[in-house]
């Protein structure tokens, strides 16, 4: 059974992941982003189901495409270095989902824009955090 300290650690990691995802979304989904129109043409795979930490496998598999799109975003409004940012997210995701069990991600039929993709994973983080608090 999870201890209170491990639950607290999980919660903090999820909050960190949530902040990173929100910051990416804020940097992209605004009218001052000169590359927004182009960035919205890229398609991302969405999880068929995302209710448990193991489903973060679906996010992990889309981090490389996410980094490629973020490389377009360098501007006055996007000060984060995509490689560092994605690396940080990857570390958190690996810790959260664990590496003991292998989970095969199932994707939804419909692809999504980067904004829809980020919003989906933000909602996932908020949902899991709410069950922990």
């Amino acid at each position: 059974a999870p201890t209170s300290s491990s639950t607290k650690k999980t919660q903090l990691q999820l909050e960190h992941l949530l902040l990173d995802l929100q910051m990416i979304l804020n940097g992209i989904n605004n009218y001052k982003n000169p590359k927004l129109t182009r960035m919205l043409t890229f398609k991302f795979y969405m999880p068929k189901k995302a209710t448990e930490l193991k489903h973060l496998q679906c996010l992990e598999e889309e981090l490389k495409p996410l980094e490629e799109v973020l490389n377009l975003a360098q501007s006055k409004n996007f000060h984060l270095r995509p490689r560092d940012l994605i690396s940080n997210i990857n570390v958190i995701v690996l810790e959260l989902k664990g590496s003991e069990t292998t989970f095969m991600c199932e994707y939804a039929d419909e692809t999504a824009t980067i904004v829809e993709f980020l919003n989906r994973w933000i909602t996932f983080c908020q949902s899991i955090i709410s069950t922990l608090t």
Partner: antibody, heavy 122, light 111 residues
């Protein structure tokens, strides 16, 4: 002094069109992004559209997408909002507002016009 | 869209007394450049909105120092240290971190 003056409002039937104008003076119009924001009678503020300082990008609220077009003529220091297929729910005071987002201060929407009233009614 | 929620919606105040308005956003408003694009606007009856505060706590030029803004992340506050007659009207919080959205407005009136 810095000023934005809207015009073009009026009473129009549902389904018809209208074009609003916003005349700018007292500042370098071509350095500023421009917004349209509306306010239905007795209600709050709703963002409608934005256009980049050079006209290169424009974005719209979902409620007006495909019906409204924002444009500008920097040589005339004028912003426009072309409105088609008007609905009763478009009835509002329409304000233009400026925003400089490549300056150091990042004030946001720091200057607003007095507004022009659009009434959509049969 | 980011949803902005203001409380209270109405605030009867006594002249010379303080007033406070809260604004909560549905998402963190920190932009990737480190700034938080949260503004406060004031609208008197029959007038257009007027910018009071930008980037959480910066007073716009000409705004009296009785107005102050604070907060971070998702929770923000506008305070008027001593309400004057000219302060009546509706106050809106607004975010431009993503596409602009406004709070519902808080009506400040004199008791």
């Amino acid at each position: 002094q810095v000023q934005l003056v809207e015009s073009g409002g009026g009473v129009v039937q549902p389904g018809r069109s209208l074009r609003l104008s916003c005349a700018a003076s007292g500042f370098t119009f071509s350095s500023y992004g421009m917004h349209w924001v509306r306010q239905a009678p007795g209600k709050g503020l709703e963002w409608v559209a934005v256009i980049w300082y050079d006209g290169s990008n424009e974005y719209y609220a979902d409620s007006v997408k495909g019906r409204f077009t924002i444009s500008r003529d920097n040589s005339k220091n004028t912003l426009y909002l072309q409105m088609h297929s008007l609905r009763a729910e478009d009835t509002a005071v329409y304000y233009c507002a400026r925003e400089e987002w490549f300056g150091e201060a990042d004030y946001g929407m720091d200057v607003w016009g007095q507004g022009t009233t659009v009434t959509v009614s049969s | 869209d980011i949803v902005m929620t203001q409380t209270p919606l109405s605030s009867p105040v006594t002249l010379g007394q303080p007033a406070s308005i809260s604004c909560r956003s549905s998402q963190n408003l920190v932009q990737s450049d480190g700034n938080t694009y949260l503004s406060w606007l004031h609208q008197r009856p029959g007038q257009p909105p007027r910018l009071l505060i930008y980037k959480i706590s910066n007073r716009f030029s000409g705004v009296p120092d009785r107005f102050s803004g604070s907060g971070a992340g998702t929770d923000f506050t506008l305070k008027i240290s001593r309400v004057e007659a000219e302060d009546v009207g509706v106050y809106f919080c607004m975010q431009t971190t993503q596409f602009p959205t406004f709070g519902q407005g808080t009506k400040v009136e004199i008791k």
